[in-house]
């Protein structure tokens, strides 16, 4: 014997209170899929979060975060304070990257430089709080007359024929 | 289950500071919103403020100017500070946790006394 | 002066169904679901209904939330004795991007 509740199709529920026919979800609720005895409520996306998708009877709310907070979390179920380039957030709330790391977005934790070393280059660019390190050529291909990296040409001034 | 618990002083004088600090346990800090709500003797209740987790507050428009509140997620607290009392501001002052799906304040403090006078 | 509005007081005697009715504007209750609390004297009030209708874990089935358009109310079926206490409505308001109370309501049982 067939279900009669797998009938009731998304943004309805099997209302058992009427003879389990299909009553559309009240207000402020939402089913996504069919055959549902009742309807879940709708999140709300209020103080922190805004309202990316507003609830449906078939779909549930979206929210993102306001601006100076980002979303964590599935679905964007927190909204975590952004911090500057070269911070990180802790309990304390957002701190100076520590000397040897950096961190070049508003969220995330301060990361180590890169060790040139390790691959065998030299250090082209300092790294600084909000930067990583510029890794350049190895410090052996830096030695006079082994130089694998081509000189760019002198550039020509005007009015000057090549010698 | 989480549970909510106000400390503070119960008598301050006009023109001082209130400070009253809410220590949340059996549970975390993070998620949620968290309000401070007063009842005057006799009268009904009174959004203060609320905190989120991560920092992002918002106050009564009526008591903005004179009002604070910080969170501090090592110890699982967070705190209300009061200026320029009257007394007007005597009242049970509450803690609460306001759900961030729903908004209802689900877990709410006993309660503590203030009494502003001199 | 609240944002909410409720009788300040309602009453019933033991048995009967009594309701207390919230009104409010398109700002709170218009655009966002009510929440409905119960205070004891000398105690911290409690969440009774979320969401317009919606009730915990641990509420009997004899209270129970609706909402329409600007107006909510809270109904009471079969009234008991330790249903006495004041009763406060509660929505978010936009404006304020924060929650707002109504006056409260004093439930008596004869």
């Known amino acids: 014997l067939q279900d009669p509740c797998s009938n009731c199709p998304a943004g309805t529920f099997c209302d058992n209170n009427r003879n389990q026919i299909c009553s559309p979800c009240p207000p402020n609720s939402f089913s996504s899929a069919g055959g549902q005895r009742t309807c879940d409520i709708c999140r709300q996306c209020k103080g922190v979060f805004r309202t990316r998708k507003e609830c449906s009877s078939t779909s549930n709310a979206e929210c993102d975060c306001t601006p100076g907070f980002h979303c964590l979390g599935a679905g964007c179920s927190m909204c975590e304070q952004d911090c500057k380039q070269g911070q990180e957030l802790t309990k304390k709330g957002c701190k100076d990257c520590c000397f040897g790391t950096f961190n070049d977005q508003k969220r995330g934790i301060c990361r180590p430089w890169t060790n040139c070393s390790l691959d065998g280059k030299s250090v082209l660019v300092n790294g600084t709080k909000e930067r990583d390190v510029v890794c350049g050529p190895s410090p052996a291909d830096l030695s006079p007359g082994a130089s694998s990296v081509t000189p760019p040409a002198p550039a020509r001034e005007p009015g000057h024929s090549p010698q | 289950q989480v549970q909510l618990q106000e400390s503070g002083p119960g008598l301050v004088k006009p023109s001082e500071t209130l400070s009253l600090t809410c220590t949340v346990s059996?549970?975390?800090?993070?998620?949620?919103?968290w309000s401070w709500i007063r009842q005057p003797p006799g009268k009904g209740l009174e959004w203060i403020g609320y905190?989120?987790?991560?920092?992002?507050?918002n106050y009564n428009p009526s008591l903005k100017s004179r009002v604070n509140i910080s969170v501090d997620t090592s110890q699982n607290q967070f705190s209300l500070k009061l200026n320029s009392l009257t007394a007007a501001d005597t009242a049970v002052y509450y803690c609460?946790?306001?759900?961030?799906?729903?908004?209802?304040?689900?877990?709410w403090g006993q309660g503590t006394t203030v009494t502003v006078s001199s | 002066q609240s944002v909410l509005t409720q009788p300040p007081s309602a009453s019933g005697t033991p048995g009967q169904r009594v309701t207390i009715s919230c009104s409010g504007s398109s700002s709170n209750i218009g655009n966002n679901p009510v929440n409905w609390y119960q205070q004891f004297p000398g105690t911290a009030p409690k969440l009774l209904i979320y969401?317009?209708?919606q009730r915990p874990s641990g509420v009997p089935d004899r209270f129970s939330g609706s909402k329409s358009g600007t107006s909510a109310s809270l109904a009471i079926s079969g009234l008991q004795s330790e249903d006495e206490a004041d009763y406060y409505c509660?929505?978010?308001?936009?404006?304020?991007?924060?929650?707002?109370f109504g006056g409260g309501t004093k439930l008596t049982v004869l």
């Open positions: 609460a946790r306001t759900h961030s799906y729903y908004y209802g304040m689900d877990v």
């Open positions: 969401s317009n209708n």
């Open positions: 509660e929505a978010w308001d936009d404006s304020l991007n924060g929650p707002v």
């Open positions: 059996g549970g975390s800090i993070s998620s949620y919103y």
């Open positions: 905190i989120y987790y991560s920092g992002y507050t």
